[in-house]
């Protein structure tokens, strides 16, 4: 028995930040779980982790240097990533493990979300004016 995960196929991070919502076919209310976001086709980099516990507030952390936060819904976890770099454009996969109460459940691998990080647009300097309007 596997949890199904839905993600947006693609997101664009215009200001180096993005909200990625992971929607699950499972209600996380009153469960103890570990939701995580992984970068790359091989999911080699664990970008962000959200630990949910029925009796404590959400624990959110990254061991890989990402600036992240998390928000919990009944059947979703939203990861808010900030200070992304252009070279962090990649495919990102949501993962969920429900530990308690048993039985242990995890998800079928999702299709992932391509996060396209656009560089910050700098205001044109007066010495180097941008293209003039017609």
């Amino acid at each position: 028995n596997k949890i199904l995960v839905k993600q947006s196929p693609m997101l664009v991070a215009y200001d180096n930040a993005v909200n990625l919502s992971c929607k699950y076919s499972y209600n996380l209310f009153s469960r103890e779980f570990r939701a995580s976001l992984h970068k790359g086709l091989d999911s080699a980099v664990e970008v962000c982790v959200v630990y949910g516990n029925y009796s404590q507030q959400l624990q959110v952390y990254s061991k890989t240097g990402f600036n992240c936060d998390g928000k919990l819904g009944n059947e979703s976890v939203t990861f808010y990533l900030q200070n992304l770099y252009v070279n962090q454009t990649d495919i990102y996969f949501c993962k969920i493990e429900v530990m308690y109460p048993p039985p242990y459940l995890d998800n079928e691998k999702s299709n992932g979300t391509i996060i396209h990080v656009k560089g910050k647009h700098l205001c044109p300097s007066p010495l180097f004016p941008g293209p003039s309007k017609p």
Epitope: E32, R34, E97, M99, Y100, P101, P102, P103, Y104, D106
Partner: antibody, heavy 120, light 111 residues
Framework: EVQLVESGGGLVQPGGSLRLSCAAS??????????VGWIRQAPGKGLEWIGE???????YYSPSLKSRVTISRDNSKNTLYLQLNSLRAEDTAVYYC????????????WGQGTLVTVSS | DIQLTQSPSSLSASVGDRVTITCRAS??????????LHWYQQKPGKAPKLLIY???SLQSGVPSRFSGSGSGTDFTLTISSLQPEDFATYYC?????????FGQGTKVEIK
Amino acid sequence: EVQLVESGGGLVQPGGSLRLSCAASGFSLSTGGVGVGWIRQAPGKGLEWIGEIYHSGSTYYSPSLKSRVTISRDNSKNTLYLQLNSLRAEDTAVYYCARYGYYYYDFDYWGQGTLVTVSS
Amino acid sequence: DIQLTQSPSSLSASVGDRVTITCRASQSVDFHGISFLHWYQQKPGKAPKLLIYAASSLQSGVPSRFSGSGSGTDFTLTISSLQPEDFATYYCQQSYRSPRTFGQGTKVEIK
């Protein structure tokens, strides 16, 4: 046949660290369906759950020990490890690893245990 | 944390006696009709051995004189006819919530 064999116990100084091993055979630590936990028993006392590791590598710890404990594994050796830091006399115990199934989380196979004595 | 309280802490019995040990949880350990409460037997110098899982299911290889019952917060381990090899300490354990917790144990001694 499922077997769990702990090693690494002995005398440790207060403030020191211990690293215990649990060699598993008869099943794979990285295959779904089962996980492995660590449980300890102080001399003449009851059983205390330390933490566990799932096939995915995710770990779960007892809140009272979380700041001092790390459970890890080496899939190539099918071996589990328990690292416990800042040891004190109260950590003196027999340390067991035990396998649990994912449906009920009952510990169906146990190692023989390894004794750790924390003393100067 | 879920506290498990076993009673009695110790008991003296004779071979052939019917023995009952109770385990009370500080909150329900039931979920979707399953009680996540297990019983173990431990002999001196040995590792615990699983006897009963999910409150009433007999672990493979365990003699049928052992049985478990109960749901919610109140559970019972019964040994229908005590045998010499049954003198040991018995523990209940819950796996409904983390941290997993054990009862303090019940020592069954020879009368």
